[in-house]
Amino acid sequence: EPAVYFKEQFLDGDGWTSRWIESKHKSDFGKFVLSSGKFYGDEEKDKGLQTSQDARFYALSASFEPFSNKGQTLVVQFTVKHEQNIDCGGGYVKLFPNSLDQTDMHGDSEYNIMFGPDICGPGTKKVHVIFNYKGKNVLINKDIRCKDDEFTHLYTLIVRPDNTYEVKIDNSQVESGSLEDDWDFLPPKKIKDPDASKPEDWDERAKIDDPTDSKPEDWDKPEHIPDPDAKKPEDWDEEMDGEWEPPVIQNPEYKGEWKPRQIDNPDYKGTWIHPEIDNPEYSPDPSIYAYDNFGVLGLDLWQVKSGTIFDNFLITNDEAYAEEFGNETWGVTKAAEKQMKDKQDEEQRTRRMMRTKMRMRRMRRTRRKMRRKMSPARPRTSCREACLQGWTEA
């Protein structure tokens, strides 16, 4: 039987307002509204929390019965839809201990886990997975790309008691591995031996000057020489102009700096590699994954352009149940959502084309009027008369 610690689908109208608490840490936090957005698969089922004000910080949270994930799997899952074509904004959640003062939640409030998509400019389109370990927020060392389109996507984080993890987007695995390998929770297992240093006679030069090579005797020639073809101008006046000196030209026999040829260094030992030793500071921690207490799920975000919808929150200990729940929510409405969006786009295209046609028609009409105004007034004649006139004139 799966343990479901938290589940929120916003299916009871305004009921969510009694379960979710707005932070009062700042007076100008943005407002969340319940909405299924401009397009959806199912207007009721797809209702979620939507950010509604541009260029705002948001801070909203919901509490649940506190639990510990010690000795069991933790699954955090939710859907995010950036229908506003997001430029810079968060789509992640934070899991807090139940000691959090929800009315004072803010960016520096200590959390256990932060997970979800984040987009900001061209440089950031990633899924954050951050664990607070021994009081410090530790970022994943891998780059997990998030979805940056306008549709709803399902994000899932699985943390297992064997210290492994998995990240899924739309119920497909996008990353997995071990917590110890992919985060810097622990000091490195090996370090450079502080007592080792490169021996003084260690020769890292692959090539050396050939000691038998010597500079040819005729090598040294000046770089510039007086131009032998230059002639003193006839009107040159030594008294007025001083002593005439021919201009200088590049010496064709100049060979530059002589360098002895290079030969393989018989004493070459290769690049010295600093030997490593076991790091005395390192000791494994089998309980990296474990937290004593989860009690609050929070949305602590910044959004330049608002419109993101969060829905289908789930915290459980059962991977299969989470996958099933994802398929029954996001999985069921995603196709219809795309259909509605495509239909809207098509209608918009048609409207645009109609508007363009109307504009063109108006422009043609205006041009015709302008031409009439500009041309000199002629007595009106019937078409027949005009044509005959044309024939006879021709």
Partner: antibody, heavy 127, light 107 residues
Framework: QMQLVQSGAEVKKPGSSVKVSCKAS????????ISWVRQAPGQGLEWMGG????????NYAQKFQGRVTITADESTSTAYMELSSLRSEDTAVYYC????????????????????WGQGTTVTVSS | SYVLTQPPSVSVAPGKTARITCGGN??????VHWYQQKPGQSPVLVIY???KRPSGIPERFSGSNSGNTATLTISGTQAMDEADYYC?????????FGGGTKLTVLG
């Protein structure tokens, strides 16, 4: 890679103000936090404040609160630091430095350090 | 306000390992960055997030951080490593720098 070019040296009288500019190129200006750090002759580095252009909000070190104003003009990719009520102790080299945001939250930049620095602007305050 | 304490100077023989410490209350819970500054030049980031090296920084630079002390280690120190080194953290919405350590490479 982002590059930061600062305005030239300034000589100012006590009580006056100075405004130093820092122009960014080769990167997306809005994807960085810009900090201002100063260094008095023979002394260490001292953080004065910073701004995240995309958020438009600046924050300042307590010591400089009320005396420093940091602004950014996204259209010209330029950050500015204005220090008022100058005194001789403000004689220093003033640096701008950038930190990549790598996220939409105001706190992201502090994970990554100040990875690009301007060449520094010497401000001399003397009567 | 948060205070970071560094030794004013550290000396090391060429090829040996230099260690520069940065002390702060519970510094192990913070992300520590290290900067190198040579005379007349702007600072350069050599370590971020306790022990990550930006591209272009030699492998001989490494960092660690736990408890109340963060450490910058330079193994196989070279003459070109002679410089001032500063640690830095973010605390309560403020960037805090240590007082700096002058590293002298002997000989």
């Amino acid at each position: 890679q982002m590059q930061l070019v600062q305005s030239g040296a300034e000589v100012k009288k006590p009580g006056s103000s100075v405004k130093v500019s820092c122009k960014a190129s080769g990167g997306t200006f809005s994807s960085y936090a810009i900090s201002w750090v100063r260094q008095a002759p023979g002394q260490g580095l001292e953080w004065m404040g910073g701004i995240i252009p995309i958020f438009g909000t600046a924050n300042y070190a307590q010591k400089f609160q009320g005396r420093v104003t940091i602004t950014a003009d996204e259209s010209t990719s330029t950050a500015y630091m204005e220090l008022s009520s100058l005194r001789s102790e403000d004689t220093a080299v003033y640096y701008c430095a950038s930190s990549p945001l790598r996220g939409s939250g105001w706190y992201w930049h502090y994970y990554y350090g100040m990875d690009v620095w301007g060449q520094g602007t010497t401000v001399t305050v003397s009567s | 306000s948060y205070v970071l304490t560094q030794p004013p100077s550290v000396s090391v023989a060429p090829g040996k390992t230099a260690r520069i410490t940065c002390g702060g209350n519970n510094i192990g819970t913070k992300s520590v960055h290290w900067y190198q500054q040579k005379p007349g030049q702007s600072p350069v980031l050599v370590i971020y997030q306790d022990r990550k090296r930006p591209s272009g920084i030699p492998e001989r630079f490494s960092g660690s951080n736990s408890g109340n002390t963060a450490t910058l280690t330079i193994s196989g120190t070279q003459a070109m490593d002679e410089a001032d080194y500063y640690c830095q953290v973010w605390d309560s919405s403020t960037e805090v720098f240590g007082g700096g350590t002058k590293l002298t490479v002997l000989g």
